[in-house]
């Protein structure tokens, strides 16, 4: 097997791990929301998980490239110029899905969980748009909703506690996960930071697979053992 094929199968395995991780991470807040939905408390953590960045973006859209890359390991139908070309083509879909996952995750990390934006955990702050993405500035990406002691006033009428010095909630050992406020913040932060990292890694593996695919097409792949003998 040439270095191209070796790297392709390695890519396939990495994409499979990331794909599964994306689906699991996306599922966490969905499961928590479903578990929490008793008769009194329809309490979604955020609405960005309902855009399925991990399940669709990092998951479903990565399946074709992952499948193609993994079959290269078996030296089967994908172990040829056409297969390598298709794997790079499918990797474009992976990159698009991963970028979608990243964009949703960035917006989710910017806004924080619903309870930090809305007194009743309503879905009013849920709209996802590319315009919002273009409005992102480095100084706005400070995650104050997570690092401040409180993410926002419970009424949602007043300004967030902007005088709360950055990371003041974390500058000491005293932070507690007994309240739903804190559980929601931790879940939201962990899930979407994880999905952002999954998206970034999928983009990198996807791009490398595109390059490898074209190299495989140009340079050719190893002949089948039967043809050598």
């Amino acid at each position: 097997m040439t270095c191209c094929e070796g790297w392709t199968s390695c890519n396939g395995f990495s994409l499979l791990v990331l794909l599964l991780l994306g689906v699991v991470l996306n599922a966490i807040p969905l499961i928590v929301s479903l578990v929490e939905e008793d008769q009194f408390s329809q309490n979604p953590i955020s609405c960005f998980e309902w855009w399925f960045p991990g399940i669709i973006g990092a998951g479903l859209m990565a399946i074709p490239a992952t499948t193609m890359s993994l079959t290269a390991r078996k030296r089967a139908c994908c172990n040829n110029r056409t297969g390598m070309f298709l794997s790079s083509l499918f990797s474009v879909i992976t990159v698009i899905g991963a970028l979608y996952c990243m964009l949703i995750s960035i917006q989710a990390l910017l806004k924080g969980p619903l309870m930090c934006n809305s007194p009743s955990n309503s879905n009013a702050n849920c709209e996802f748009s590319l315009k919002n993405i273009s409005d992102i500035h480095p100084e706005s990406f400070n995650l104050q909703w997570f690092f401040n002691d409180s993410c926002a006033p419970p009424t949602g009428f007043n300004k967030p506690t902007s005088n709360d010095t950055m990371a003041s909630g974390w500058r000491a050992s005293s932070f507690h996960f007994d309240s739903e406020e804190n559980k929601h913040r931790l879940i939201h932060f962990s899930v979407f930071l994880g999905l952002l990292l999954v998206g970034i890694l999928e983009v990198l593996f996807g791009l490398s697979q595109i390059v490898i695919g074209f190299l495989g097409c140009l340079c050719g792949v190893s002949k089948r053992r039967s043809q050598i003998v």
Epitope: A172, S173, S174
Partner: antibody, heavy 119, light 107 residues
């Protein structure tokens, strides 16, 4: 606006029990813990404990275990504290306070419930 | 339990003065301290949390400082509505413990 409305004053006999309430409004009740604090006339403050209304989880000051019982009702957004086997030492004003942030700090306070234990 | 020692227990001051109230914890509390105000016959109001941060709606004449085990609350340009009892509270450990209080009186 966050409001914590506590029940009225209580005059009880030694050995009896009393149950006071704290009705929350202006925020999502299940998202924050509810603390209870004791203030004896002319004396300092003592933290009794807190309840997480979402799952009814509680944390008590060792000193008040067996004395105070914290409960809550999600449907009415009300927290309750029951004090048992009352003595004159339990005569005090009892406050509920919303616990917010990573530190579960006392962010908003009720107006207090005066409990007088007298024969 | 962490013991919070607050001083002074009372002080007489005039309108427009600047006052400082101090609180010493029996061990380091890593800025996990809050300051509360109680007006006569009334309930409590949170002023400062995590040593230096103002609660919403609290005037900027209130400020907090300190680190380790020693903290202070400073009120500049005292106004008539500031005459009350002030308490410190530690958020570092359970059980939560309070200072003994400082009563601000008009001179």
């Amino acid at each position: 606006e966050v409001q914590l409305q506590q029940s009225g004053p209580e005059l009880v006999k030694p050995g009896a029990s009393v149950k006071m309430s704290c009705k929350a409004s202006g925020y999502r009740f299940t998202n924050y813990v509810m603390h209870w604090v004791k203030q004896k006339p002319g004396q300092g403050l003592e933290w009794i404990g807190y309840i997480n209304p979402y799952n009814a989880g509680t944390k008590y000051n060792e000193k008040f275990k067996g004395k105070a019982t914290l409960t809550s009702d999600k449907s009415s957004s009300t927290a309750y504290m029951e004090l048992s086997s009352l003595t004159s030492e339990d005569s005090a004003v009892y406050y509920c306070a919303r616990g917010a942030g990573w530190s579960l700090r006392f962010a908003d306070w009720g107006q207090g419930t005066l409990v007088t234990v007298s024969a | 339990d962490i013991l919070m020692t607050q001083s002074p227990s009372s002080m007489s001051v005039s309108l427009g003065d600047t006052v400082s109230i101090t609180c010493h914890a029996s061990q380091g509390i890593s800025s996990n301290i809050g300051w509360l105000q109680q007006k006569p016959g009334k309930s409590f109001k949170g002023l400062i949390y995590l040593a230096t941060n103002l609660e919403d709606g609290v005037p900027s004449r209130f400020s907090g400082s300190g680190s380790g085990a020693d903290y202070s609350l400073t009120i500049t340009s005292l106004e008539s509505e500031d005459f009350a009892v002030y308490y410190c509270v530690q958020y570092s450990q359970f059980p939560r413990t309070f200072g003994g209080g400082t009563k601000l009186e008009i001179k």
